[in-house]
């Protein structure tokens, strides 16, 4: 037993029984201790969701996470998971995985909006993009939920002591 | 005063599974993440995984996934971790710790595990 | 996973001298202007006591005769004057990456 001590730079609600949080959702890239989405905190020593700090922070086990995110804002646009690539549905549309459905079967009834190649291949001149084929096969973003960020992690060490007393 | 308290020592048979306890107290239980750590006879420390009351948040060591699992429960202060398809590799200490600013600062007494036929 | 390496791996030294304990890391345990690298102390039959955090911090009633200094990638810590009472075991442990890892540690005897 133990405890912290002295700085030489200065200084909820009932659950039923019991609550169990599997080990699962682990990607294999290195090992990961934190499940996909979640980055490790080492002043909590937990795994906290990357939503909290993708538009303050870099944190390099969020990175393809925060990227995704903000594709996903941007609209008429989708993130491959396999690529690791923000793709515009505008240049997959007839080819296009259910993400951009939406946006790809609107366009369709709108050919004015369409791009030229598009446009050329609702008028029967079809464009060889062999290498879009088969690439996209919808694989769904599971978002986890967002847990409370940790304040205060840019401070210096005397400020963190405080913060995290 | 900050107290956790492990349960008594195990002595099990290979295959077979342990479910051991570390009951906390003297502080927010919410408030920090319990983590398990693995001391093999005369050897270094190994961490498995740690469990957050708060958050669900559990990271966990690979080497131990299918070998621990981690369960809380908040109305006594309590966590749990349960070993199965025991073998003798995984006779050792196992102690919880309390962690807090990136530090495991409370340790329990350890639990002892002996698996033997 | 971050790998320390401890040196000594044992250590005899007098009374009332000092003793230093060191320790490397494979990669920087630097996180937001502070180095996440703890030590422990441990005695036989008893668990791990936290004797200093982030590289250079007391632990709960651990005397001044401790100390620890470093940054990035190298650490050590200091005992002075030594003390019979400071015998044991004591083992590094970073915190920056998970998984936390620790040193194999030094076992610390007197002269």
């Known amino acids: 037993m133990s405890g912290l001590g002295r700085s030489r730079r200065g200084g909820r609600s009932r659950v039923d029984q019991e609550e169990r949080f599997p080990q699962g959702l682990w990607t294999g890239v290195a090992m990961r201790s934190c499940p996909e989405e979640q980055y490790w905190d080492p002043l909590l020593g937990t795994c906290m969701s990357c939503k909290t700090i993708c538009n303050h922070q870099s944190q390099r086990t969020c990175a393809a996470f925060c990227r995704s995110l903000s594709c996903r804002k941007e609209q008429g646009k989708f993130y491959d998971h396999l690529l690791r690539d923000c793709i515009s549905c505008a240049s997959i549309c007839g080819q296009h995985p259910k993400q951009c459905a939406y946006f790809c079967e609107n366009k369709l009834r709108s050919p004015v909006n369409l791009p030229p190649e598009l446009r050329r291949q609702r008028s029967g001149e079809v464009e060889n993009n062999s290498d879009n084929s088969g690439r996209y096969q919808g694989l769904e973003h599971r978002g986890s939920e967002a847990s409370p960020a940790l304040p205060g992690l840019k401070l210096s060490a005397d400020q963190v002591a405080l913060v995290y007393s | 005063e900050v107290q956790l308290q492990q349960s008594g020592p195990e002595l099990v048979k290979p295959g077979a599974s342990v479910k051991i306890s570390c009951k906390t107290s003297g502080y927010t239980f919410t408030e920090s993440t319990i983590h398990w750590v693995k001391q093999s006879h005369g050897k270094s420390l190994e961490w498995i995984g740690g469990i957050s009351p708060n958050n669900g948040g559990s990271p966990f060591n690979q080497k131990f996934k299918g070998k621990a699992t981690l369960t809380v429960d908040k109305s006594s202060s309590t966590v749990y971790m349960e070993l199965r398809s025991l073998s003798s590799e995984d006779s050792a200490v196992y102690y919880c710790a309390k962690w807090v600013r990136g530090a495991m600062d409370f340790w329990g007494q350890g639990t002892s595990v002996t698996v033997s036929s | 996973d971050i790998v320390l390496t401890q040196s000594p791996a044992s250590l005899a030294v007098s009374l009332g001298q000092r003793a230093t304990i060191s320790c490397r890391a494979s990669?920087?345990?630097?996180?937001?202007?502070?180095?996440?690298m703890n030590w422990f102390q441990q005695k036989p039959g008893q668990p791990p006591k936290l004797v200093i955090y982030?590289?250079?911090n007391q632990g709960s009633g651990v005397p001044a005769r401790f100390s620890g200094s470093g940054s990035g990638t190298d650490f050590r810590l200091n005992i002075h004057p030594l003390e019979e009472d400071d015998t044991g075991m004591y083992f590094c442990q970073q915190s920056k990456e998970a998984p936390p890892t620790f040193g194999g540690g030094t076992k610390l005897e007197i002269k």
């Open positions: 982030a590289a250079s």
């Open positions: 990669e920087s345990v630097d996180y937001y202007g502070m180095s996440l």
